[in-house]
């Protein structure tokens, strides 16, 4: 059939293929120290490594790009490691009226997949 | 803001960003031929060229990430060229009793993101 | 819901051309793929050509080749036929018609149309 | 080419059934469509994949494909459903082939 199984095991070793991992940060690396109260020191979760073939497929479309790069490497790209999910999280802003709290939806990984 | 505005003019040249492009496959190519017909060679639309900073960023994590890609790019990859979303495509298949028709709402992109 | 709207009736002299034009609403106007389908009077469905859009690429009957070009502009998602070298029997009404696009075979299972355009060729 | 074969004109008694037939070589292996014309209106998709109908057509319609012949089949024929009949599949280079149009017309 079209969807044919991702593939879930790594072959190219523990940690190098597509999956999440925590980065810190701080408000200065994204350059919102001057609206952003907290917190002073971010973790956030990052979609890492690599895409073997049929490694985590998000869907048709990423095995059919799989395929099709294993054929004509320089004109298909291999799928690469991107979030599935994400976690929403809280930051507190500065405002003009003092502070507020706001939810980013779209900040944090939750979950990676290939595409 | 935590969402700057994603550049949409690609800085690296014509052609040289995150697109849209059409790849022809034929249904071996895709490992198809025993159970999908088509007369001729398929079109598929596919995602593909560099994203070059906050070019065309999917979303807040997109662009925290190209920031962090900057100061740690042995850390965090660069964001890359990904379906935003996708087109219907209908497909013929092969089926005991003949032929019959199959929609896939994941198999061809309509527009493409960095992220 | 979708909407295909196209240009009105024409009247044209042999040897001439017209360009037809369909404007599409209420739907993602790349995702589909457009035809155009004529119809004589008194006689029936004849297909034409049609263009993909998301692919740019236009299929012509063999029919047609080389007299009929189709293009869409994905700005105004109006899609255009001119139709080249008319003669008497080109006298037909004129329709587009949208459908999924069916990988390989491209066009076909229309589901909406628009309402036709006369295009009457005479001296 | 490949070509699809229907009668001119059926007729069919108000409340019966009506078979309009499509021929055409092996036409079992197509995918056939149906399409409703009514005079001065476009044509309308009634039958597509054997027997699927789109939104608002209603269960009066079904189709059947087999051998040479694809059928068209109207239940309870109404005095609305008195039209041009069309039926439509591809050819060996995948372009659109239409069939030459049957005219019902229900009596009573």
């Known amino acids: 059939s079209a969807h044919a199984h991702p593939r879930d095991s790594c072959p190219l070793g523990p940690g190098r293929c597509c999956h999440l991992e925590t980065v810190q940060a701080t408000l200065e690396d994204l350059g919102w120290s001057d609206w952003v109260l907290s917190p002073r020191q971010l973790q956030l979760s990052m979609c890492v490594g690599e895409c073997p073939h049929l490694y985590r497929s998000a869907n048709t479309h990423a095995q059919i790009k799989a395929r099709l790069h294993g054929l004509q490497p320089d004109k298909v790209p291999a799928p690469c490691c991107v979030p599935s999910s994400y976690t929403p999280v809280v930051l507190m802003h500065r405002t003009d009226s003092g502070v507020s709290l706001q939810t980013y939806d779209d900040l944090v990984a939750r979950g990676c997949h290939c595409a | 803001s935590a969402h700057a505005h994603p550049r949409d003019s690609c800085p690296l040249g014509p052609g040289r960003c995150c697109h849209l492009e059409t790849v022809q496959a034929t249904l071996e190519d895709l490992g198809w031929s025993d159970w999908v017909l088509s007369p001729r060679q398929l079109q598929l639309s596919m995602c593909v060229g560099e994203c070059p900073h906050l070019y065309r960023s999917a979303n807040t994590h997109a662009q925290i990430k190209a920031r962090l890609h900057g100061l740690q790019p042995d850390k965090v990859p660069a964001p890359c060229c990904v379906p935003s979303s996708y087109t219907p495509v209908v497909l013929m298949h092969r089926t005991d009793s003949g032929v019959s028709l199959q929609t896939y709402d994941d198999l061809v992109a309509r527009g493409c993101h960095c992220a | 819901q979708v909407q295909l709207v196209q240009s009105g009736a024409e009247v044209k002299k042999p040897g001439s051309s017209v360009k037809v034009s369909c404007k599409a609403s209420?739907?993602?106007?790349?995702?589909?793929?457009v035809s155009w389908v004529r119809q004589a009077p008194g006689q029936g469905l004849e297909w034409m050509g049609g263009?993909?859009?998301?692919?740019?690429?236009?299929n012509y009957a063999q029919k047609f080749q080389g007299r009929v070009t189709i293009t869409a502009d994905e700005s105004t998602s109006t899609a255009y036929m001119e139709l080249s070298s008319l003669r008497s029997e080109d006298t037909a009404v004129y329709y587009c018609?949208?459908?999924?696009?069916?990988?390989?075979?491209?066009?076909?299972?229309?589901?909406?149309w628009g309402q036709g355009t006369l295009v009457t060729v005479s001296s | 080419s490949y070509e699809l074969t229907q009668p001119l004109s059926v007729s069919v008694a108000l409340g019966q059934t009506a078979r309009i037939t499509c021929s055409g070589d092996?036409?079992?292996?197509?995918?056939v469509s149906w399409y409703q014309q009514k005079p001065g209106q476009a044509p309308v998709l009634v039958i597509y994949?054997?027997?699927n109908r789109p939104s608002g057509i209603p269960e009066r319609f079904s189709g059947s494909n087999s051998g040479n012949t694809a059928t068209l089949t109207i239940s309870r024929a109404q005095a609305g459903d008195e039209a041009d009949y069309y039926c439509?599949?591809?050819?060996?280079?995948?372009?659109?082939?239409f069939g030459g149009g049957t005219k019902l017309t229900v009596l009573g």
């Open positions: 018609a949208r459908g999924p696009i069916i990988m390989g075979y491209q066009f076909g299972l229309f589901d909406h």
């Open positions: 209420g739907g993602t106007f790349r995702s589909y793929a």
């Open positions: 263009i993909i859009p998301i692919f740019g690429t236009a």
């Open positions: 092996n036409i079992g292996s197509h995918i």
């Open positions: 994949d054997k027997s």
């Open positions: 439509q599949t591809w050819d060996s280079i995948g372009s659109v082939v």
